[in-house]
Interface confidence: medium
């Protein structure tokens, strides 16, 4: 049984007959094929369904589609397949929703081979309504909405072409031929790389990174020679081609690609990659794979430039180009990440950062647990989360880790307890203070998330039998009732909210299986009414995060600030409710070394704070490329830690003198670069 | 050592206001919740509300709302509670608390060092 | 408000006896209790806090045990020092709460 499931756990009074007038069934009147589920909109209630099923006829694949549409969060479903003219759409392409709350939806249609193009279906009053358009290009990408404007869409056709509607798909232009690849920036701003020859594969290394900030009225060629380029934060990065060998380096821009840096990263050769982990408008986590066929390589953290880089993690689990890595953004607590790492005997262990990637160290092993057999010293040893890379390798781990921003503190993820990972069947672990300590919260594998900003979190066990039992718990997985919601057991396969975990609504999935035929179910359960009442002040304590020494002044600094924040109360049984906002209070910190990064040409020896020069360049003049300049810098070796808010204390000062020499960079310096117009 | 010390025993009317000190020393001030607690003669113990020293945001139990106010002096490391409108039922010993830490969590850990207690005499 | 009670108001031991106190709340308050001793004219001592766990310097014959509603103190051994009156408090909900108190004294 569950952990909590026992005379000792608060009941929830009356919670089956309250569960059994909030449940709805609906059962889908198909063939069980493909089921694909989109929200429309925040807090709408609206949910697509598609589901398409494939017969394999011996010349040709006959395929059906049926679209549904929720508009009370899935109680109810309606079949509008007719607003879509019963055409068989795409699954491949899913549904493209609309930024925010636009209330746009875009399907793409399967259609006859000798057409002249694709077609798609659009809808802009939250799928109400449909509007049939035949493209004069066949798509061979999801449209893409621009993150400033719905009706601003782009799409990549099969011929290589990059096309752009200004009218949300009801008119569409080619702006450019021999695309590679495309993406929106901002202030609808679009980036894209061309190849001159033959194609996008053979051209690799060789393409040419253009912008236009006009919908393709005008163009400017902002890199050449690039291998491939990306967008984080407020950086865009691109993978450059050395002149004079085959290895390539990543160049940093903040200016939309008006002027570019070289990233202070190690080159990278053909069989290696560079990865963004992560990145927000501060700073950027980048992934850079070791030579040979490894399976990992080093994290490294980016200064407010994108330019100078810190070494953060070394053995950094990560198997191959667009391959399976385990890193993980711990949405609920400021500066959390977690990941993995591959150790010298080829286990594979977790890491936790809780100062955005500063230092990393084991999770702290959960308290009344006992350690595996992977471990060596049977009273010692850490947490291991199973993530990506489990999944990828079919171990018995439904699901990767999950925290929301508004659920403050709270991860859920399976875990084994040892010295590495266990390919044993997992349990499923919790921590409520964002990854400092941890609990076992069910015994077993199972699906999870979280309702209502974490007041409550529903589970399923994670079963190969059909399943009819839902567990939840409102008091943060400390105690789990058991709810049947079904008499006849469903083949169980995925748990659906509303994305941001504000709802008090889940939706289990699932098919029936009868002699002659199998049909898509959903159960939707509305968990208002054991959240009877809305929480109100006394509901909540205070908790300050990343507290882990009272006595300290400094308790609770991170990045130069501490956050206390409004809590629920894990006994209090009440609604935060759809406004819910996280109420937090932050106090800024006094400077120390430990907010500060080391500059270029500096590094912190192991368990010191101090930043030493690093010996070969000791009594050199620093030269770095800045901006296509070469540049002198004279610094104390300190550079303050992106997002870092600390004010007084420790102060070191830095000065960059600029020699304005050209750099030997291959890459476009700002004067060569051209423009032209359409 | 960590120690809460209050001020001496106060005699007071009917209508009054008696403010009580309770000045920490040996730990960091503003890092722990301060509690008041006060025990009638031959009675049990009764919470009259906490101050947050480091934001000196309060919450006061209904019963007292409206006459007590907890303050604090961060640079003096000293708390204060102040009861107005005195009756002779308020008649009582007060304590200082401090609320016990744990992993971040300000309440819920009862409070692990206590004042001396000031004697309050209400009488007319 | 909570409600805590207490029971037994009173009880007399002798030196060497096991004691149990228990302490019952009128709504779920998880783990959040806490167990004080107070000696006559004396500020109370915390003994136990979130329900089990023994605050430092406190004796092991002093343990707590409970979830939910119900909560108990036991005292292993009674010693002579361990006659005083003992309090639960609650402290997940505001207002924080005391039991009405437990005086153990000589048989």
């Known amino acids: 049984s569950a952990p909590g499931e026992d005379e000792e756990c608060g009941r929830v009074r009356d919670f089956v007959a309250k569960l059994a007038n909030n449940t709805h069934q609906h059962v889908f009147d198909d063939l069980r094929g493909s089921v694909s589920l989109s929200w429309v909109g925040d807090s709408t209630g609206v949910i697509l369904v598609l589901t398409t099923f494939h017969v394999p006829l011996v010349i040709m694949t006959f395929g059906q589609s049926k679209l549904y549409r929720s508009e009370d969060y899935g109680k109810n479903f309606k079949d509008i397949t007719d607003l879509i003219n019963n055409t068989f759409i795409r699954t491949e392409f899913g549904m493209a929703i609309g930024p925010e709350n636009s209330g746009k939806v875009v399907l793409t249609a399967e259609v006859s081979g000798g057409s002249r193009g694709g077609r798609i279906f659009r809808s802009s009053d939250f799928a109400k309504n449909f509007v049939q358009t035949d493209l004069p290009f066949h798509p061979l990408t999801q449209m893409m909405y621009s993150p400033q404007n719905s009706d601003y869409l782009l799409a990549l056709s099969t011929e290589n072409g990059l096309w752009v509607s200004k009218n949300f798909g009801g008119k569409w232009e080619e702006i450019h031929k021999a695309v590679c690849l495309a993406k929106w920036g901002s202030d609808n701003t679009i980036f894209f790389t061309t190849y001159a020859n033959g194609s996008c594969k053979a051209d690799l290394g060789a393409l040419e990174l253009w912008r236009t900030s006009d919908l393709g009225k005008s163009f400017k060629t902002i890199g050449v020679k690039i291998y491939s380029f990306g967008l984080g934060g407020r950086f865009l990065f691109a993978s450059v081609m050395a002149d004079k060998d085959t290895t390539r380096r990543i160049h940093v821009s903040t200016d939309q690609g008006d002027t570019w840096s070289m990233a202070q990263l190690p080159s990278v050769g053909q069989e290696q990659f560079y990865s963004i982990l992560a990145a927000n408008d501060d700073m950027v986590f980048m992934h850079v794979d070791e030579p040979g066929d490894t399976g990992f390589g080093t994290i490294f953290t980016s200064d407010d430039r994108g330019i100078v880089y810190s070494k953060s993690l070394d053995r950094h689990l990560y198997t191959t180009t667009g391959g399976e890595t385990d890193f993980t953004n711990v949405t609920s607590l400021r500066g959390v990440y977690i990941t993995s790492v591959l150790s010298e005997d080829n286990s594979i262990q977790t890491m936790i950062t809780f100062d955005q990637g500063g230092r990393w160290t084991h999770l702290r092993k959960p308290e009344n647990s006992e350690c595996d057999a992977t471990a060596k010293n049977k009273n010692e040893c850490s947490l291991h989360i199973h993530a990506s890379y489990s999944i990828s390798q079919k171990l018995n781990v439904p699901m990767a880790p999950l925290s929301e921003p508004n659920a403050v503190g709270i991860v859920i993820a399976h875990g084994s307890v040892g010295d590495a990972i266990s390919v044993m069947v997992p349990d499923v672990y919790i921590s409520d203070d964002g990854g400092y300590s941890w609990t076992k919260m069910l015994e077993g594998p199972h699906y999870y998330t979280i309702l209502d900003s974490g007041g409550i979190i529903v589970a399923i066990e994670h079963s190969s039998r059909p399943i009819n039992v839902i567990k939840f718990s409102t008091d943060e997985g400390q105690c789990w009732q058991t709810y049947t919601f079904t008499r006849d057991p469903i083949y169980f396969t995925g748990l659906a909210s509303e994305p941001g975990a504000r709802s008090m609504n889940i939706s289990i999935w699932g098919f029936t299986e009868s002699f002659l035929t199998s049909q898509w179910v959903s159960y939707t359960i509305d968990f208002k009414d054991i959240l009877e009442r809305n929480c109100e002040e006394k509901d909540y304590t205070i908790w300050l995060a990343h507290s882990t020494d009272p006595e300290d002044y400094e308790d609770g600094c991170i990045l130069g600030y501490k956050e206390q924040f409004l809590r629920l109360r894990k006994s209090s049984v009440c609604q935060n409710g759809r406004d819910y906002v996280v109420t937090k209070q932050p106090s800024i910190c006094l400077c120390s070394l430990e907010d500060f990064l080391c500059d270029f040409g500096y590094y912190r020896p192991e368990n010191d704070s101090k930043c030493v020069e690093q010996p070969e360049l000791k009594g050199h003049d620093l030269e770095f490329c800045l901006y296509g300049r070469e540049e002198h810098l004279t610094t104390n070796g300190y550079r303050k830690i992106p997002g870092d808010k600390c004010q007084g204390g420790v102060n070191p000062v830095r000065e960059v003198k600029d020699l304005k020499k050209k750099c030997t960079s291959n890459f476009l310096s700002p004067e060569k670069q051209n423009s032209k117009s359409n | 050592q960590v120690q809460l010390v209050q001020s001496g025993a106060e005699v007071k009317k009917p209508g009054a206001s008696v403010k009580v000190s309770c000045k920490a020393s040996?730990?960091?001030?503003?890092?722990?919740?301060m509690h008041w607690v006060r025990q009638a003669p031959g009675q049990g113990l009764e919470w009259m509300g906490w101050?947050?020293?480091?934001?000196?945001?309060?919450r006061y139990a209904q019963k007292f709302q409206g006459r007590v106010t907890m303050t604090r002096d961060t640079s003096i490391s000293t708390a204060y509670m102040e009861l107005s409108r005195l009756r002779s039922d308020d008649t009582a010993v007060y304590y200082c608390a401090r609320g016990k830490r744990s992993s971040g969590w300000y309440e819920g850990y009862g409070m692990d060092v206590w004042g001396q207690g000031t004697t309050v005499t209400v009488s007319s | 408000d909570i409600q805590m009670t207490q029971s037994p108001s009173s009880l007399s031991a002798s030196v060497g006896d096991r004691v149990t106190i228990t302490c019952r709340a009128s709504q779920s308050i998880s783990s959040y209790l806490n167990w004080y001793q107070q000696k006559p004219g004396k500020a109370p001592k915390l003994l136990i806090y979130a329900a089990s766990s023994l605050q430092s310097g406190v004796p092991s014959r002093f343990s707590g045990s409970g979830s939910g509603t119900d909560f108990t103190l036991t005292i292993s051994s009674l010693q002579p020092e361990d006659f005083a009156t003992y309090y639960c408090q609650q402290s997940d909900v505001s207002p924080i709460t005391f039991g009405g108190g437990t005086k153990v004294e000589i048989k």
């Open positions: 040996g730990y960091t001030f503003v890092a722990y919740y």
């Open positions: 101050i947050n020293p480091n934001s000196g945001a309060t």
